[in-house]
Protein backbone atom coordinates (compact mmCIF):
# COMPACT_ATOMS: atom_id res chain seq x y z
CA UNK A 1 0.00 0.00 0.00
CA UNK A 2 1.31 3.46 -0.91
CA UNK A 3 1.32 5.52 2.27
CA UNK A 4 3.71 8.27 1.26
CA UNK A 5 2.96 11.83 0.27
CA UNK A 6 4.89 14.30 -1.87
CA UNK A 7 5.25 17.84 -0.62
CA UNK A 8 6.16 20.41 -3.27
CA UNK A 9 6.76 24.13 -3.48
CA UNK A 10 3.32 24.37 -5.13
CA UNK A 11 2.66 27.33 -7.41
CA UNK A 12 5.72 29.55 -7.77
CA UNK A 13 6.73 32.54 -9.82
CA UNK A 14 10.09 33.88 -10.86
CA UNK A 15 11.37 36.63 -13.08
CA UNK A 16 12.63 36.28 -16.60
CA UNK A 17 16.40 35.82 -16.73
CA UNK A 18 16.51 34.63 -13.13
CA UNK A 19 16.68 31.16 -11.63
CA UNK A 20 14.41 29.03 -9.48
CA UNK A 21 14.74 25.87 -7.42
CA UNK A 22 12.16 23.14 -7.98
CA UNK A 23 11.90 21.04 -4.83
CA UNK A 24 9.86 18.02 -3.79
CA UNK A 25 9.99 15.98 -0.60
CA UNK A 26 8.65 12.47 -0.03
CA UNK A 27 7.40 11.75 3.47
CA UNK A 28 5.26 9.29 5.47
CA UNK A 29 6.77 6.16 3.95
CA UNK A 30 9.66 3.82 4.73
CA UNK A 31 10.08 3.15 0.99
CA UNK A 32 13.56 3.64 -0.45
CA UNK A 33 13.95 6.23 -3.18
CA UNK A 34 15.78 4.65 -6.10
CA UNK A 35 15.35 7.38 -8.72
CA UNK A 36 13.82 10.81 -9.15
CA UNK A 37 12.72 12.03 -12.58
CA UNK A 38 12.03 15.69 -13.30
CA UNK A 39 9.68 16.36 -16.20
CA UNK A 40 8.18 19.42 -17.84
CA UNK A 41 4.84 18.37 -19.29
CA UNK A 42 5.95 15.30 -21.30
CA UNK A 43 9.62 16.25 -21.62
CA UNK A 44 12.26 14.68 -19.42
CA UNK A 45 14.50 17.34 -17.87
CA UNK A 46 16.69 15.28 -15.59
CA UNK A 47 17.10 12.01 -13.71
CA UNK A 48 18.76 11.45 -10.37
CA UNK A 49 19.47 7.74 -9.92
CA UNK A 50 20.57 6.47 -6.50
CA UNK A 51 23.50 4.60 -8.00
CA UNK A 52 24.32 6.39 -11.25
CA UNK A 53 23.81 9.96 -10.04
CA UNK A 54 22.48 12.79 -12.19
CA UNK A 55 21.72 12.81 -15.89
CA UNK A 56 20.52 16.06 -17.47
CA UNK A 57 18.74 15.84 -20.83
CA UNK A 58 21.07 17.22 -23.53
CA UNK A 59 18.56 19.86 -24.65
CA UNK A 60 18.48 21.34 -21.12
CA UNK A 61 22.17 20.99 -20.19
CA UNK A 62 22.90 24.74 -20.43
CA UNK A 63 20.02 25.85 -18.23
CA UNK A 64 19.42 23.07 -15.73
CA UNK A 65 21.62 22.31 -12.74
CA UNK A 66 21.25 19.34 -10.38
CA UNK A 67 20.31 19.95 -6.78
CA UNK A 68 20.16 21.03 -4.14
CA UNK A 69 19.55 17.47 -2.92
CA UNK A 70 17.02 15.79 -5.20
CA UNK A 71 15.75 19.15 -6.38
CA UNK A 72 16.48 20.89 -9.67
CA UNK A 73 17.66 24.44 -10.42
CA UNK A 74 16.36 26.15 -13.57
CA UNK A 75 18.50 29.04 -14.80
CA UNK A 76 18.20 31.83 -17.38
CA UNK A 77 14.43 31.59 -17.23
CA UNK A 78 12.30 32.61 -20.20
CA UNK A 79 8.57 33.17 -20.42
CA UNK A 80 8.38 29.87 -22.33
CA UNK A 81 9.43 28.06 -19.15
CA UNK A 82 6.02 28.84 -17.67
CA UNK A 83 4.08 25.65 -17.09
CA UNK A 84 3.77 22.45 -15.08
CA UNK A 85 6.76 20.56 -13.72
CA UNK A 86 6.60 17.09 -12.21
CA UNK A 87 8.88 15.27 -9.82
CA UNK A 88 8.45 11.50 -10.03
CA UNK A 89 9.89 9.56 -7.11
CA UNK A 90 10.53 5.91 -7.94
CA UNK A 91 10.57 3.94 -4.70
CA UNK A 92 10.93 0.37 -3.48
CA UNK A 93 8.56 -1.23 -2.82
CA UNK A 94 5.81 1.38 -3.17
CA UNK A 95 6.32 2.33 -6.81
CA UNK A 96 6.09 5.85 -8.23
CA UNK A 97 4.93 9.01 -6.42
CA UNK A 98 4.33 12.17 -8.45
CA UNK A 99 4.40 15.79 -7.31
CA UNK A 100 3.32 18.82 -9.34
CA UNK A 101 4.74 22.34 -9.39
CA UNK A 102 3.36 25.20 -11.49
CA UNK A 103 5.96 27.80 -12.47
CA UNK A 104 5.05 31.18 -13.84
CA UNK A 105 7.87 33.20 -15.37
CA UNK A 106 7.10 36.90 -15.30
CA UNK A 107 8.60 39.93 -16.99
CA UNK A 108 10.96 41.59 -14.49
CA UNK A 109 8.75 44.59 -13.72
CA UNK A 110 5.73 42.37 -12.99
CA UNK A 111 7.67 39.90 -10.88
CA UNK A 112 9.01 42.67 -8.64
CA UNK A 113 5.49 43.43 -7.45
CA UNK A 114 4.12 39.88 -7.46
CA UNK A 115 4.38 37.38 -4.63
CA UNK A 116 7.31 35.06 -5.03
CA UNK A 117 8.12 31.84 -3.24
CA UNK A 118 11.80 31.01 -2.90
CA UNK A 119 13.32 28.10 -1.05
CA UNK A 120 15.93 29.33 1.42
Amino acid sequence: MMTGTIETTGNISAEKGGSIILQCHLSSTTAQVTQVNWEQQDQLLAICNADLGWHISPSFKDRVAPGPGLGLTLQSLTVNDTGEYFCIYHTYPDGAYTGRIFLEVLESSVAEHGARFQIP
Epitope: M2, T30, Q32, D51, P93
Partner: antibody, heavy 120, light 107 residues
Framework: EVQLVQSGSELKKPGASVKVSCKAS????????MNWVRQAPGRGLEWMGW????????AYAQDFTERFVFSLDTSVTTAYLQISSLKAEDTAVYYC?????????????WGQGTLVTVSS | DIQLTQSPSFLSASVGDRVTITCRAS??????LAWYQQKPGKAPRVLIY???TLQSGVPSRFSGSESGTEFTLTISSLQPEDLATYYC?????????FGQGTKVEIK
Protein backbone atom coordinates in the same frame (compact mmCIF):
# COMPACT_ATOMS: atom_id res chain seq x y z
CA GLU B 1 32.05 -7.38 -9.36
CA VAL B 2 28.92 -7.31 -7.20
CA GLN B 3 29.00 -9.95 -4.46
CA LEU B 4 26.88 -10.82 -1.43
CA VAL B 5 28.78 -13.17 0.87
CA GLN B 6 26.90 -14.70 3.78
CA SER B 7 28.15 -16.16 7.05
CA GLY B 8 28.52 -19.91 7.50
CA SER B 9 26.07 -22.58 8.64
CA GLU B 10 24.77 -22.47 12.22
CA LEU B 11 23.54 -25.22 14.52
CA LYS B 12 21.47 -23.84 17.40
CA LYS B 13 19.32 -25.15 20.22
CA PRO B 14 15.65 -24.15 20.57
CA GLY B 15 15.32 -20.86 22.44
CA ALA B 16 18.73 -19.59 21.34
CA SER B 17 19.42 -16.67 18.97
CA VAL B 18 21.34 -16.48 15.71
CA LYS B 19 22.72 -13.61 13.67
CA VAL B 20 23.30 -14.14 9.95
CA SER B 21 25.51 -11.66 8.09
CA CYS B 22 25.51 -10.62 4.44
CA LYS B 23 28.62 -8.73 3.34
CA ALA B 24 28.11 -6.58 0.24
CA SER B 25 30.96 -5.67 -2.09
CA UNK B 26 31.39 -4.26 -5.59
CA UNK B 27 28.69 -1.63 -5.15
CA UNK B 28 27.43 0.99 -2.69
CA UNK B 29 25.32 -0.86 -0.11
CA UNK B 30 23.21 2.18 0.79
CA UNK B 31 21.96 2.68 -2.79
CA UNK B 32 20.12 -0.63 -3.07
CA UNK B 33 17.37 -2.06 -0.84
CA MET B 34 18.22 -5.44 0.70
CA ASN B 35 15.79 -8.33 1.08
CA TRP B 36 15.78 -11.52 3.14
CA VAL B 37 14.30 -14.76 1.80
CA ARG B 38 13.74 -18.04 3.67
CA GLN B 39 13.72 -21.53 2.20
CA ALA B 40 12.78 -24.38 4.53
CA PRO B 41 14.07 -27.86 3.60
CA GLY B 42 12.34 -29.12 0.45
CA ARG B 43 10.12 -26.01 0.33
CA GLY B 44 9.78 -22.92 -1.84
CA LEU B 45 11.04 -19.36 -1.43
CA GLU B 46 9.43 -17.11 1.20
CA TRP B 47 10.01 -13.35 1.18
CA MET B 48 10.68 -12.25 4.77
CA GLY B 49 10.92 -8.52 4.18
CA TRP B 50 13.50 -5.88 3.38
CA UNK B 51 15.59 -3.09 4.85
CA UNK B 52 15.92 0.43 3.55
CA UNK B 53 19.70 0.63 3.32
CA UNK B 54 19.57 4.40 3.11
CA UNK B 55 17.70 4.96 6.38
CA UNK B 56 18.14 1.60 8.13
CA UNK B 57 14.36 1.22 8.39
CA UNK B 58 13.16 -2.43 8.13
CA ALA B 59 9.81 -3.76 6.89
CA TYR B 60 8.69 -7.30 7.65
CA ALA B 61 6.32 -9.68 5.89
CA GLN B 62 3.35 -10.80 7.99
CA ASP B 63 4.87 -14.06 9.25
CA PHE B 64 8.15 -12.43 10.28
CA THR B 65 7.13 -9.56 12.56
CA GLU B 66 7.83 -11.14 15.96
CA ARG B 67 11.28 -12.68 16.39
CA PHE B 68 13.10 -11.41 13.32
CA VAL B 69 15.24 -8.26 13.10
CA PHE B 70 16.97 -6.80 10.04
CA SER B 71 19.85 -4.39 10.62
CA LEU B 72 22.83 -2.81 8.90
CA ASP B 73 26.37 -1.78 9.64
CA THR B 74 27.28 0.51 6.76
CA SER B 75 30.85 0.91 8.03
CA VAL B 76 31.50 -2.74 7.13
CA THR B 77 28.93 -2.81 4.26
CA THR B 78 27.03 -5.63 5.91
CA ALA B 79 23.35 -6.45 6.40
CA TYR B 80 22.23 -8.71 9.26
CA LEU B 81 19.32 -10.96 10.06
CA GLN B 82 18.83 -11.83 13.72
CA ILE B 83 16.37 -14.49 14.86
CA SER B 84 15.61 -14.86 18.55
CA SER B 85 13.82 -17.61 20.52
CA LEU B 86 14.63 -20.12 17.80
CA LYS B 87 12.16 -22.93 17.06
CA ALA B 88 12.61 -26.16 15.12
CA GLU B 89 10.49 -24.69 12.31
CA ASP B 90 13.08 -21.92 11.80
CA THR B 91 15.38 -24.55 10.31
CA ALA B 92 15.99 -23.25 6.79
CA VAL B 93 18.40 -21.66 4.37
CA TYR B 94 18.30 -17.87 4.66
CA TYR B 95 19.26 -15.71 1.68
CA CYS B 96 19.98 -12.01 1.37
CA UNK B 97 19.08 -10.57 -2.04
CA UNK B 98 19.68 -7.12 -3.49
CA UNK B 99 16.85 -5.22 -5.16
CA UNK B 100 17.81 -3.96 -8.61
CA UNK B 101 16.93 -0.30 -8.93
CA UNK B 102 15.30 -0.64 -12.31
CA UNK B 103 11.65 0.33 -12.47
CA UNK B 104 10.46 -3.20 -11.67
CA UNK B 105 12.65 -4.09 -8.66
CA UNK B 106 13.65 -7.70 -9.23
CA UNK B 107 16.33 -9.32 -7.07
CA UNK B 108 19.46 -9.19 -9.22
CA UNK B 109 22.11 -10.54 -6.82
CA TRP B 110 21.74 -13.17 -4.10
CA GLY B 111 23.97 -14.37 -1.31
CA GLN B 112 24.97 -18.04 -1.33
CA GLY B 113 22.61 -18.76 1.56
CA THR B 114 23.14 -19.62 5.23
CA LEU B 115 21.75 -22.85 6.64
CA VAL B 116 20.38 -22.43 10.16
CA THR B 117 19.56 -25.72 11.87
CA VAL B 118 17.57 -25.66 15.11
CA SER B 119 17.74 -28.93 17.00
CA SER B 120 17.94 -30.06 20.60
CA ASP C 1 -2.57 -9.67 -0.62
CA ILE C 2 -2.06 -10.71 -4.23
CA GLN C 3 -1.57 -14.45 -4.66
CA LEU C 4 0.51 -16.13 -7.36
CA THR C 5 -0.51 -19.58 -8.60
CA GLN C 6 2.22 -21.37 -10.50
CA SER C 7 1.65 -24.45 -12.66
CA PRO C 8 2.58 -27.17 -13.12
CA SER C 9 4.36 -27.95 -9.86
CA PHE C 10 6.44 -30.61 -11.62
CA LEU C 11 7.27 -31.41 -15.21
CA SER C 12 9.46 -33.92 -16.97
CA ALA C 13 10.66 -33.21 -20.50
CA SER C 14 13.33 -34.34 -22.94
CA VAL C 15 16.36 -32.39 -24.12
CA GLY C 16 15.28 -30.17 -27.02
CA ASP C 17 11.64 -29.94 -25.89
CA ARG C 18 9.80 -26.65 -25.60
CA VAL C 19 8.78 -26.13 -21.98
CA THR C 20 6.15 -23.69 -20.67
CA ILE C 21 5.52 -22.67 -17.05
CA THR C 22 2.58 -20.47 -16.09
CA CYS C 23 2.09 -18.04 -13.22
CA ARG C 24 -1.33 -16.49 -12.58
CA ALA C 25 -1.81 -13.45 -10.34
CA SER C 26 -5.04 -13.07 -8.35
CA UNK C 27 -5.12 -9.36 -9.33
CA UNK C 28 -3.47 -7.20 -11.97
CA UNK C 29 0.23 -6.59 -11.34
CA UNK C 30 1.07 -4.92 -14.67
CA UNK C 31 4.53 -6.15 -15.73
CA UNK C 32 5.85 -6.40 -12.18
CA LEU C 33 6.86 -10.04 -12.40
CA ALA C 34 10.20 -11.85 -12.41
CA TRP C 35 11.25 -15.45 -13.04
CA TYR C 36 14.06 -17.17 -11.13
CA GLN C 37 15.93 -20.42 -11.63
CA GLN C 38 17.22 -22.37 -8.64
CA LYS C 39 19.53 -25.29 -9.25
CA PRO C 40 19.86 -27.94 -6.51
CA GLY C 41 21.91 -26.66 -3.57
CA LYS C 42 22.36 -23.19 -5.10
CA ALA C 43 20.91 -19.71 -4.63
CA PRO C 44 18.23 -18.55 -7.07
CA ARG C 45 19.22 -16.41 -10.05
CA VAL C 46 17.01 -14.06 -12.02
CA LEU C 47 16.16 -15.06 -15.60
CA ILE C 48 13.44 -12.60 -16.59
CA TYR C 49 12.21 -9.34 -15.05
CA UNK C 50 9.50 -6.91 -16.04
CA UNK C 51 7.63 -10.01 -17.29
CA UNK C 52 9.54 -10.08 -20.60
CA THR C 53 13.06 -8.64 -20.17
CA LEU C 54 15.88 -11.17 -20.32
CA GLN C 55 18.51 -10.66 -17.61
CA SER C 56 22.00 -10.03 -18.97
CA GLY C 57 23.96 -13.28 -19.37
CA VAL C 58 20.87 -15.53 -19.50
CA PRO C 59 20.64 -17.76 -22.60
CA SER C 60 18.15 -16.61 -25.25
CA ARG C 61 16.25 -19.92 -25.08
CA PHE C 62 14.52 -18.42 -22.02
CA SER C 63 11.70 -15.96 -22.67
CA GLY C 64 8.80 -14.43 -20.80
CA SER C 65 5.37 -13.25 -21.89
CA GLU C 66 2.26 -11.80 -20.28
CA SER C 67 -1.42 -11.72 -21.04
CA GLY C 68 -3.48 -9.88 -18.45
CA THR C 69 -2.86 -11.60 -15.13
CA GLU C 70 -1.24 -14.68 -16.71
CA PHE C 71 2.53 -14.84 -17.14
CA THR C 72 4.52 -17.48 -18.96
CA LEU C 73 8.14 -18.61 -18.85
CA THR C 74 9.19 -20.54 -21.95
CA ILE C 75 12.33 -22.57 -22.52
CA SER C 76 12.43 -22.98 -26.29
CA SER C 77 14.80 -25.95 -26.32
CA LEU C 78 15.41 -27.66 -22.98
CA GLN C 79 19.06 -28.34 -22.13
CA PRO C 80 20.50 -30.73 -19.49
CA GLU C 81 21.73 -27.75 -17.44
CA ASP C 82 18.14 -26.46 -17.16
CA LEU C 83 17.36 -29.07 -14.48
CA ALA C 84 16.16 -26.77 -11.71
CA THR C 85 13.15 -25.36 -9.88
CA TYR C 86 11.65 -22.20 -11.39
CA TYR C 87 9.83 -19.52 -9.39
CA CYS C 88 7.79 -16.49 -10.38
CA UNK C 89 7.76 -13.43 -8.11
CA UNK C 90 5.52 -10.39 -7.96
CA UNK C 91 7.41 -7.14 -7.50
CA UNK C 92 4.92 -4.31 -7.48
CA UNK C 93 4.12 -3.79 -3.81
CA UNK C 94 4.68 -4.87 -0.23
CA UNK C 95 4.50 -7.74 0.48
CA UNK C 96 6.43 -9.33 -2.34
CA UNK C 97 5.69 -13.01 -2.89
CA PHE C 98 6.85 -16.02 -4.86
CA GLY C 99 4.94 -18.71 -6.69
CA GLN C 100 5.09 -22.25 -5.29
CA GLY C 101 7.76 -23.31 -7.79
CA THR C 102 7.95 -25.67 -10.77
CA LYS C 103 10.49 -28.48 -10.63
CA VAL C 104 11.80 -29.34 -14.09
CA GLU C 105 13.26 -32.80 -14.59
CA ILE C 106 15.11 -34.03 -17.67
CA LYS C 107 13.75 -37.33 -19.04
Amino acid sequence: EVQLVQSGSELKKPGASVKVSCKASGYTLTNYPMNWVRQAPGRGLEWMGWINTNTGSPAYAQDFTERFVFSLDTSVTTAYLQISSLKAEDTAVYYCARTAITSVYHFDYWGQGTLVTVSS
Amino acid sequence: DIQLTQSPSFLSASVGDRVTITCRASQGISSYLAWYQQKPGKAPRVLIYGATTLQSGVPSRFSGSESGTEFTLTISSLQPEDLATYYCQKLNSHPSSFGQGTKVEIK
